[in-house]
Interface confidence: low
């Protein structure tokens, strides 16, 4: 039976050229966390692996960078990154657990939602 | 010792395919990805595909449906199957792998993929 629950930074926006921390995490469960995938809609962007460590996708390794913790760093933002991020937290026993992140990159300074969770 | 070793490539006609192959040997530990990437007269290198252990692929956006990238992992080897090669597929392909997260720690010699009539 699943019984854990993913919490995530929500609908977070950020400043063009700015950078951002993707962040999710799992509670109410003593799974443990075998993986957790990034993903951007269809795309693979990195994993986390318990024994393996992390791998970026090479498409994105100039503009993410890992953590902290098991989160994912976006940096040099366009406009284009605006959309939808999962975090998909595989793990044994439970199975999957996913939690959506929904990032709007604005052209000037009327990002103040999520503004915590941004890089100075 | 650690050596990539490549192999399959040559002189193909636009639209025509071929399979490279990179084998790996002297890892203690099974590489946690291989990949290619290639480099043409006179340009930067650049990332083409790469494959986790687990399975999980990756593709650049000039390659992407055309190019299959694949491995198996008991051999430790890395497979790029090109189909509907272009002219501007032509560069050197090199084999790279990682055994841990981080920068890229292995590198071939790379093979000479021309794409010409």
């Known amino acids: 039976m699943m019984t854990g629950t993913i919490e995530t930074t929500g609908n977070i926006s950020a400043e063009k050229g700015g950078s951002i921390i993707l962040q999710c995490h799992l509670s109410s469960t003593t799974a443990q966390v075998t993986q957790v995938n990034w993903e951007q809609q269809d795309q693979l962007l990195a994993i986390c692996n318990a024994d393996l460590g992390w791998h970026i996708s090479p498409s994105f390794k100039d503009r993410v960078a890992p953590g902290p913790g098991l989160g994912l760093t976006l940096q040099s933002l366009t406009v284009n990154d605006t959309g939808e991020y999962f975090c998909i937290y595989h793990t044994y026993p439970d199975g999957t657990y996913t939690g959506r992140i929904f990032l709007e990159v604005l052209e000037s300074s009327v990002a103040e939602h999520g503004a915590r969770f941004q890089i100075p | 010792e650690v050596q990539l070793v490549e192999s399959g490539g040559g002189l193909v006609q636009p639209g025509g395919s071929l399979r490279l192959s990179c084998a790996a040997s002297?890892?203690?530990?099974?590489?946690?990805?291989m990949g290619w990437f290639r480099q043409a007269p006179g340009k930067e290198r650049e990332w083409v595909a790469s494959?986790?252990?687990?399975?999980?692929?990756w593709y650049a956006d000039s390659v992407k449906g055309r190019f299959t990238i694949s491995a198996d992992n008991s051999k430790n080897t890395a497979y790029l199957q090109m189909n509907s090669l272009k002219p501007e597929d032509t560069a050197v392909y090199y084999c790279?792998?990682?055994?841990?997260?981080?920068?890229?720690?292995?590198w071939g010699q790379g093979t000479l993929v021309t794409v010409s009539s």
């Open positions: 790279a792998s990682e055994v841990a997260s981080g920068e890229t720690d292995y």
């Open positions: 002297g890892f203690t530990f099974s590489p946690s990805w």
């Open positions: 494959v986790l252990r687990g399975g999980y692929t």
